[in-house]
Amino acid sequence: ELCDDDPPEIPHATFKAMAYKEGTMLNCECKRGFRRIKSGSLYMLCTGNSSHSSWDNQCQCTSSATRNTTKQVTPQPEEQKERKTTEMQSPMQPVDQASLPGHCREPPPWENEATERIYHFVVGQMVYYQCVQGYRALHRGPAESVCKMTHGKTRWTQPQLICTGEMETSQFPGEEKPQASPEGRPESETSCLVTTTDFQIQTEMAATMETSIFTTEYQ
């Protein structure tokens, strides 16, 4: 069952998926000037059995300059508005991902892949939040969100993370100040599969992270 909405936004925070539940779809998107190969897959799908999960289908891009007899179905900007976008992910993975049953690892990048990845999450998916660089966790309760099915509708749980600029807070004497987290940027949440139209999307990788991070920032 696909989740109706995107994971919730947290100001000055980013979320990441450590692994993707079976049933998750990743759109095959190509960067500007490229398109999916003729009769290429529209998406990759996380599938598997009790012992192993992997991504079905392969995304392949070819130069738009190459004329094909069959018209390629490249999403137009208007169509993109109906989809959820995430920034290009790092192929580096935490070691424990492979041991999570019923989940796929982050798919490796494909040649001429678009800078944004468009995922379609399923019920049971969990994402993890952290404050972006320059902000720190004033309060870190459960800093994750899970897509759950209740009363026939899907709903993401609310992460209890409050990120604040260094100068905005004070602490009790003796309290240790948490460190600012690596850079990352939060995701848009305006419809179930939505593009990030009203704020800038930037690509970056946090060297200290061993997993993919979503990188859409509220400027």
Partner: antibody, heavy 115, light 107 residues
Framework: QVQLQQSGAELVRPGVSVKISCKGS????????MHWVKQSHAKSLEWIGV????????SYNQKFKGKATMTVDKSSSTAYMELARLTSEDSAIYYC????????WGQGTSLTVSS | DIQMTQTPASLSASVGETVTITCRAS??????LEWFQQKQGKSPQLLVY???TLAEGVPSRFSVSGSGTQFSLKINSLQPEDFGSYYC?????????FGGGTKLEIK
Amino acid sequence: QVQLQQSGAELVRPGVSVKISCKGSGYTFTDYAMHWVKQSHAKSLEWIGVISTYSGDVSYNQKFKGKATMTVDKSSSTAYMELARLTSEDSAIYYCARGVTFDSWGQGTSLTVSS
Amino acid sequence: DIQMTQTPASLSASVGETVTITCRASENIYSFLEWFQQKQGKSPQLLVYNAKTLAEGVPSRFSVSGSGTQFSLKINSLQPEDFGSYYCQHHYGIPYTFGGGTKLEIK
């Protein structure tokens, strides 16, 4: 079920301080930050500040710095707010509310400052 | 500080009618907005969080729209229990601020 139980109404003289409490129950207290909100006839609802129930870290609305001091006692699952140097302007109802989205509120503590 | 401007400040309506309350932020707050309902002598109660998600137990006659700087709360087919005050509030950066409120009264 989730409950935030606040201390009772206070009638105090100008110039003194008062400390009001908010006890959380029915959930893991340290999972949710605690906010304090002032409601007066003149100003509707005003956010005073927030305290991490886990670390004691605090952040205040600039307007209430020096006026309000928020603390927390994890062992009793209670958040406190002390209001100093009280004047008639501080007469209001004060609420505690939990979490990122203020999903549960205390019943309010009425504070009257009068000579 | 981000200013939240609510309109109208008050309105009268009859049971069964539809009303809309709007909230405007002085700058982009994305979807970091909550709506609260407060009945006379009671605490505020969360109605909507993150601009578009109805809180647990909130009837479907309540609907919301907007993101960025313009938001609205619509109540279809007003019920007697819907009368009271409504507030919007942002949680995009400190200090959080509330709208001035909208008092919904029975006509």
